[in-house]
């Protein structure tokens, strides 16, 4: 199983059988009357993984997912029949597919489902403390799920619940045509993106939503939505997809005369993830599939990891691109996209930009406007007509950090762990695929920290049958990875150091930041441990320097090093 170290070949390739035999995967193979284990909520404090599925919500123990509680939340027979009469599939559509699962407060979760094409939401009691062992549906309190969950289970939803308000990117109608970014719940009138205007949203597929602070003043907080959508005519010849990042001010309450109960601070920009191609034409990875925000020292400046695939039928490929929030903010402070009419090209807007600059949050920091309802008419008019930025956001180092083009799978999900190793910190990516495998990739800084080399450490099959991975969460506390698909949920440790072999050289050559040779075995590396010198070299994977004892003998000839 141990492969030699070419970038595109995993050092360790483990089949599902091997994962099981080595106790490296625990699988929950689903219930007979459920499926679609797509909606994850990780609660490290309670040591639970909440999972929304078809007609069910689960609470798995993070230590071992075989230990779980479940809530059954189906639709009524009447509702199911109405759905069937509307021409929908009784098994695949006429059920309650859970699409939203968020922490509401200290004692409750908020959950929404498709409700057999009639979205519905409710609260789930989870108690104050883990030992309360409470997990029950609030049967007396159901709410309309419109603008929160889609009607159609096939549609993606991105949501975020903060301060009792739910931000959702979803379809608000039965037909799945009226896509919008909503803010619901709370005490205010719902707010949404402009209706019937393809410049705002053009058949989007929502990926995720995140709150990111702009400054130390909470009035400047913004909610960022990641999505992909059809490129607007004139942006591209032919039908194309663009990956997007959209921003909204948390304290946006809509306009006064125009954009009433609509966002006044919504802006969007294109995310570029491409490689130079032949004839000087870049190959674009435009189909954004997943996003992970790596919050390290500064929560205002997380690193954004995006997983992309190509939309081409001829060329199938996947990539991971990294973005910095400073680059994102720079684009949102740059020129707006403008065109004089449907038959004109998009150009950077050259005219006078009204004050305060559209997209700026009303706060005491900038502009002195207390509310979006106080914004001057020219700001609202401009915002309504110019939701898109002209410049795209380019990835760090202007290229992907991971590319896969010669394989029979595509990337679907990503989570990232920052690991302390002997020679520094490394970001380890766990990338889910559409065939049920997980790739473990480490990005290794070269000359500069953003000039990265990627090393494919492991390729693990985590489900018995090939099935697309649709959800992933990583628990740093448990050092475990949790994976969701249509078929079920899987759990695996972040590291399998013992599998790298019985010698120092093999451990060193693995270049796995989690693992180091401790003198007798390849085991988990803890930077705080006062153990005897650990042999590890992630940057170069050089056993000659680090394995001075007999651990190398007789083994070096088997592992040709290609870096």
């Amino acid at each position: 199983n141990y492969q030699n170290g070419k970038n595109n070949v995993p050092r360790l390739k483990l089949s599902y059988k091997e994962m099981l035999e080595s106790n490296n995967v625990i699988t929950f193979n689903g219930l007979a009357n459920s499926s679609s284990y797509h909606t994850f909520l990780l609660d490290e404090e309670r040591s639970r993984l909440y999972v929304g599925a078809k007609d069910h919500i689960f609470s798995f123990d993070l230590v071992n997912i075989k230990d779980f509680q479940k809530i059954v939340w189906p639709v009524s027979y009447t509702r199911r029949d109405e759905c069937k009469w509307a021409g929908k599939d009784i098994l695949k559509e006429c059920a309650n597919f859970i699409k939203v699962l968020k922490a509401y407060n200290q004692t409750h979760l908020y959950a929404c489902g498709t409700g057999a094409f009639h979205p519905i939401c409710t609260y789930i009691e989870i108690g104050h403390h883990p030992e309360d062992n409470i997990f029950k549906l609030e049967n007396s309190h159901f709410e309309n799920g419109r603008g929160k969950s889609p009607y159609d289970p096939k549609l993606l939803t991105a949501s975020l619940l903060i301060d009792g308000e739910l931000y959702s990117g979803t379809a608000a109608d039965f037909m799945g045509r009226d896509f919008a970014i909503f803010r619901t719940l709370g005490h205010h009138h719902p707010i949404r993106t402009e209706q019937h205007d393809s410049r705002w949203l053009n058949d989007p597929k929502f990926i995720s939503a995140h709150l990111i602070s702009e400054s130390d003043n909470p009035e400047d907080d913004k909610v960022y939505f990641f999505f992909r959508e059809n490129a607007i005519d004139g942006e591209h010849s032919g039908k194309a997809t663009h990956a997007r990042i959209g921003q909204i001010c948390k304290n946006d309450f809509g306009g006064h005369r125009s954009l009433v109960n609509k966002w006044t601070t919504f802006l969007k920009a294109r995310l570029i993830c491409s490689v130079p191609g032949p004839n000087g034409i870049d190959t674009h990875f435009d189909e954004l599939q997943d996003v992970f925000l790596m919050n390290f020292k500064d929560p205002k400046n997380p690193v954004v990891y995006g997983v992309f695939t190509t939309s081409s039928n001829i060329f199938k490929g996947s990539a991971v691109c990294m973005y910095s929030m400073s680059d994102v903010r720079r684009v949102f402070l740059g020129p707006y996209a403008h065109r004089d009419g449907p038959n004109y090209q998009w150009v950077p807007y050259q005219g006078r930009v009204p004050y305060p600059r559209p997209g700026t949050c009303p706060s005491k920091t900038f502009g002195g406007f207390d509310s979006t309802k106080d914004l001057p008419d020219d700001v609202i008019t401009f915002a309504r007509s110019h939701p898109a930025m002209y410049n795209p956001v380019f990835p760090m180092n202007n290229r992907p950090i991971v590319i896969k083009t010669d394989v029979n799978y595509q990337f679907t999900q990503i989570v990232v762990d920052r690991v302390d190793a002997e020679d520094g910190q490394y970001d380890v990516m766990f990338i889910g695929t559409d065939v049920g495998t997980v790739l473990k990739v480490v990005s290794i800084p070269k000359e500069t920290w953003y000039d990265l080399e990627e090393v494919l450490l492991e390729e693990m099959t985590v489900f018995r049958e090939p099935t697309a991975i649709s959800a992933m969460e990583l628990s740093t506390k448990q050092q475990q990875l949790y994976i969701g698909s249509t078929a079920g949920v899987a759990q695996l440790p972040l590291h399998r150091c013992d599998i790298y072999g019985k010698a120092c050289a093999e451990c060193c050559l693995a270049r796995d930041p989690y693992c180091a040779w401790d003198g007798s075995a390849c085991s988990r590396y803890f930077p705080t441990a006062k153990a005897r010198t650990r042999a590890q070299d992630i940057r170069n994977g050089d056993p000659l320097t680090h394995c001075s004892d007999g651990g190398i003998e007789g083994r070096m000839d088997h592992h040709h090093h290609h870096h």
């Epitope: 094409f117 309309n144 603008g147 009607y151 019937h196």
Partner: antibody
């Protein structure tokens, strides 16, 4: 005070054309979606067509699709309905109506209506 | 044939309470879309009476109230007055063509 004033109705032969206008005042016209709704003599209301504030979205009832064209001129605060290939069943009072979107879920309501203009299609 | 079904007529004596029903399907009212009600006095244009199932625009007396449940909605008028004699229409969103759907209308007659 919000006012909508339709004009352009009249008697026309089957296959003929008419252009209806609706002059709006008392509100920011270019902030609202506008619609045409008709009512055949002694019958109920039927939505005919709708247009978004910037004409980016336009929709028609199947019964008029391909024959009627809705448009607006925000600089003149005016909504139009060009009706071609008129049929006897198009005989109705045509109302211009503003979409209010007052409800929580932004489902269109018609918060202001004009007094209507009668279109009679007959030979 | 209207997409939403209303009774053709209802009647009541002054001071009485009457209700007008409006029945749709799973692709309009039953899909969670809001219902709005209009009053059309003889020879005049319709006027918005109730929006968003149960909300009254300013100027509409509180004798008028609306509710919605499942695939149906209803308009209730209490303390019936002679000037309430009119046609009443319910309306909802459909998401499919036609994008807006109306009921066939209900003629309210105030007896006496």
């Amino acid at each position: 005070e919000v006012q909508l004033l339709e004009s352009g109705g009249g008697l026309v032969q089957p296959g003929g054309s008419l252009r209806l206008s609706c002059a709006a005042s008392g509100f920011t016209f270019d902030s609202y979606e506008m619609n045409w709704v008709r009512q055949a003599p002694g019958k109920g209301l039927e939505w005919v067509s709708g247009i978004s504030w910037n004409s980016g979205w336009i929709d028609y009832a199947d019964s008029v699709k391909g024959r009627f064209t809705i448009s607006r001129d925000n600089s003149k605060n005016t909504l139009y309905l060009q009706m071609n290939s008129l049929r006897a069943e198009d005989t109705a009072v045509y109302y211009c109506a503003r979409s209010g979107y007052s409800s929580s879920w932004f489902d269109p309501d018609f918060d202001y209506w004009g007094q209507g203009t009668l279109v009679t299609v007959s030979s | 044939q209207s997409v939403l079904t209303q009774p053709p007529s209802v009647s009541g004596a002054p001071g009485q309470r009457v209700t007008i029903s409006c029945t749709g399907s799973s692709s309009n009212i039953g899909a969670g879309y809001d219902v709005h009600w209009y009053q059309q006095l003889p020879g005049t244009a319709p006027k918005l009476l109730i929006y968003g199932n149960s909300n009254r625009p300013s100027g509409v007396p509180d004798r008028f109230s609306g509710s919605k449940s499942g695939t149906s909605a209803s308009l209730a008028i209490t303390g019936l007055q002679a000037e309430d004699e009119a046609d009443y229409y319910c309306q909802s969103y459909a998401g499919i063509n036609p994008y807006v759907v109306f009921g066939g209308g209900t003629k309210l007659t105030v007896l006496g």
